[in-house]
Structures are given as C-alpha cells and as structure tokens.
Amino acid sequence: DGCKDIFMKNEILSASQPFAFNCTFPPITSGEVSVTWYKNSSKIPVSKIIQSRIHQDETWILFLPMEWGDSGVYQCVIKGRDSCHRIHVNLTVFEKHWCDTSIGGLPNLSDEYKQILHLGKDDSLTCHLHFPKSCVLGPIKWYKDCNEIKGERFTVLETRLLVSNVSAEDRGNYACQAILTHSGKQYEVLNGITVSITERAGYGGSVPKIIYPKNHSIEVQLGTTLIVDCNVTDTKDNTNLRCWRVNNTLVDDYYDESKRIREGVETHVSFREHNLYTVNITFLEVKMEDYGLPFMCHAGVSTAYIILQLPAPDFRAY
C-alpha cells in the first residue's frame, strides 16, 4: 500500500480507566495530513463515533475506558499529499491497581512512573495526563502509599504536587487521581508514580543522566523506518551537548550523503529543578549494515547505546 512503517515504543497502561494516545510524527503531521487509526492490522478503521468506547478523536485514539482485551498493536496511518506513514504503537494493559493487589499489577516502570524529589529542597511531582480537548479533567487528588496526602508541606497546583522541605520519608509510591468528563460521562484516572529522594544539589550534580536508551538491543525488521528517542535529564544551567554518534562520528556527518539516518531536533521540558531533553535518531530505512553497530547517545560525559538486531525467525509461520 506504499506506506512507510514506523515502530514506536510500548505503552503500558492500566485497565478500567481512560487512556488516549496522540498520533504525532513532527516531520509529517505539521502539514496538511489525514490521520486514521486501526487495530491489529484490521482494514476497518477505529470508529469516530464519540459514543463508542474506543474511538478516534481528531488525531487521538481514545479508550473510555481501557479494558484488558484492548492490549495489542495499533496503527495510525498519516497520509499527506505525497506521502503515507504507518505508525505502530504497542499497548499493553495491566489489570490491577497497586493499592488493590500486587497480582497482575504494573509489570515494569516507564519513566513517567518514576520521579525524583530533592532532599531539603522545595520540589514537585507531576501527574501526567494526556487527553484530547474533548476530555475535561477535574481537580487532582494525590495519594502516598495508598493513603490520601494531607498536611501543610503539600500543595496541589494544577497537575503538580508541590512538596516543601523534602525529607527522606517522602520517598515511596504515589498516585494522582483525576475525574475525567467526556460527553457527560465521568471516569476516574489513577496514575502510579514511584518516588525516590536524592541528596545531590541541582539535578544529579553536573553529570547528565540518560534515562533512555539503556545500552540494549532493539529488534527491528529490515527496510522499516525506526525512531529512537534519547531522553536526558540535566541541570537547568548545564552547557552539555546532546547528540547521536556512530563509529565516533556524528550521525548527520556519517550519513551526510545518503541522509538515511538523521538526528532530530532537540526538544526539552522544563521542570522546577531540571530539564528533560529529548533528541531522536531516525532510520528512514533500516539496512543490513546497521545491525550490530552501537548507535551512541552522548550527553556531556554520559553515553548510552542501542544496537539494532534482526527479529528472531518466527518458526510458527512455516
């Protein structure tokens, strides 16, 4: 069908609560494009009827709520005047909330589930709530170790929990809860966050921390398009450069002629004590020569790599 395949990272989500994912791919979606969502390579698009439990809302796919059986690979097809891209998103649903049981709960922690508070300082936690404009979010309640947070050291400000004079006892498991209203119906959103405490000044001193990648391999089919983010936390006043290299050379220089592999434009989100930087690497078409090479993300003195590897053959197909 002439569409280029792009594989995004897995999303791990909680059952019985709303979830939304926005189909954005900056080089493409910035222009005049149409976006259509599909599930598990189905030829039938996801419904656009707002009464449907799963429906497309502009560029978003919206689950009201997510259910256990919704796990799977979803595709959004972005069609421009001269291009077509199919973005694959793997959604994994876990069933139980931590406060109810440890069984069938969150199987591992993505970075949104991990946050840091700085000892002795005034700091904050963020409740990540990503939904389309059609969803109205009510005030947020915060919980620590499954008990509602009360006390003068804690202040709720929009999507943040402000914590004054952070102490070692503030580490633990937090949750933020919001009521989401859509088409007159109300749903509860509950996000878990594991919080650790650091004594270091600023954000981990002057050494930037690469959150992703983590020196690992990524299975990817030959010929596909792949985008990998490098996520870095660093102090607000840092002067570190962030870039992708291969064979000790900047990828943009290494692939200067073909431009087949390019470094993306760096973006950052500013937090009270630190910045979270993202710079991606895009493989327009994965070739055999890419396998086994360490593609390095550099951030100041910190480095982390990914290595592309061919998926293991699926013998069930034969």
Epitope: W98, N108, D145
Partner: antibody, heavy 119, light 108 residues
C-alpha cells in the same frame, strides 16, 4: 539490601493457634506487599495471601480463608500471620516474602518458620 | 486458578552438560509475570529469573529463560555442581498466585 527476619520454630498441639512474625529491615521502601508462602515437607510452594502494610488491605488464597489471618504493625515494620485450628496438614515451613511496586516477583524472602503440629 | 506444570520432576546432568526444564501454564500468562526461583534444602527460595528472561542479581550468565503464553523454559548452558537444586516457576498474573511443583536438578 532488605532483610526479612522471621520468628522461631513452633511445636504445637492440634487445635491450637499460632502467630508467626516477619520483621522487615534494611533498605525497604515504604510501600510493598508482604506475602506468605507455605511449603510442606517434600512438597512444593503454596501461596497463602498478601497484605499491604500501609493500609492493612489483605487478599487471600481461597484455600486459606479461615485458616490464616494477616495483620501488620506499621510502627515496627512487622507483619504477622495467625494460623488457627491447627492440624497435622498445617505442619510446614512458612515464608514471608516481599513484592515491590513495578516488580511483580518475590525478590526477598525470610529464612522461614518451621511449624510442627503433633499430638 | 492457573496451574503450572513443570517437567521433568527430577533430572540429572553431568558437569558441562546443557540442561533445559519447562514450565507449562494451564492458561496464558504474560511474560512479565512469569518467574523462576532456585531452592536448596534448608534455605529459602532465591529469585533466579524474573519476567521470563531477566537474570536476578548474582545469577551466573550460563542461566537463561525464555517463553511466552503457556510455555516457558529455564536453560543452563553448561551444568556446574552448584546448580544442583530444585527450581520452581511462579506466576504473578492471576490470583491466586501459583508455583510449579518444581524440577529437582541433580548432579550426575
């Protein structure tokens, strides 16, 4: 490193009750589920139930409802399991073990408490 | 409840031999929730492999785990004397939590 220190060996008569303890120390985070597991001599492992110390919430294996009761003393980071109406089939080693948020496996185990029920 | 069947129940291997034991679930278990423990007589179980294929801290790299759905396995690439123990698989996906009946690995 986390340590789970369990109470000592118990020798009991049929029909008696016993309260086993498990004290968590070391680098424990404040939120974890404490689980209890039974192993009879020469047999496999059997899950009894779990308790969340921060709230006292419990979940049990149906096979142990009415037999085991899980409680906790938050101030001393100690979990307890009371076994009632003891019979010979309750003779076993009982382990406490911890599950942390985002890690649905038993990373740390107590040394076990041997319970022997004999007339 | 999910029943985990381990096979073989008992096996023996020579020094340097490759060893594979299996764990079959009565219904599908997500790979994130399938784990293995090593147990030696008089000691508590030790986490050995978590989430199907991740080695716990201190576990020798000769061990590996794999599988999905209802079929999982634990492999030792080259048997060592210290590997003699009973190995249990465990699912933390559905209540009640269950364990396999164990595979006892002996040194030949």
């Amino acid at each position: 490193q986390v340590q789970l220190q369990q109470s000592g060996t118990e020798l009991l008569k049929p029909g008696a009750s016993v309260k086993l303890s498990c004290k968590a120390s070391g680098n424990t985070v404040t939120s974890y589920w404490m689980h209890w597991v039974k192993q009879r001599p020469g047999q496999g492992l059997e899950w009894i139930g779990e308790i969340l110390p921060s709230t006292g919430r419990t979940n049990y294996n149906e096979n142990f409802k009415g037999k085991a009761m899980l409680t906790v003393d938050k101030s001393s980071s100690t979990a307890y399991m009371q076994l009632s109406s003891l019979a010979s089939e309750d003779s076993a080693v009982y382990y406490c073990t911890i599950v942390y948020f985002g890690n649905p496996w038993f990373a740390y185990w107590g040394q076990g408490t041997l319970v022997t029920v004999s007339a | 409840q999910i029943v985990l069947t381990q096979s073989p129940a008992i096996m023996s291997a020579s020094l340097g031999e490759r060893v594979t034991m299996t764990c079959t679930a009565s219904s599908s278990v997500s790979s994130s929730y399938l784990h293995w423990y090593q147990k030696k007589p008089g000691s508590s179980p030790k986490l050995w492999v978590y989430s199907t294929s991740n080695l716990a801290s201190g576990v020798p790299v000769r061990f590996s785990g794999s599988g999905s759905g209802t079929s999982y396995s634990l492999t030792i690439s080259s048997m060592e004397a210290e590997d003699a123990a009973t190995y249990y698989c465990h699912q933390h996906h559905r209540s009640p939590v269950t364990f396999g009946s164990g595979t006892k690995l002996e040194m030949k």
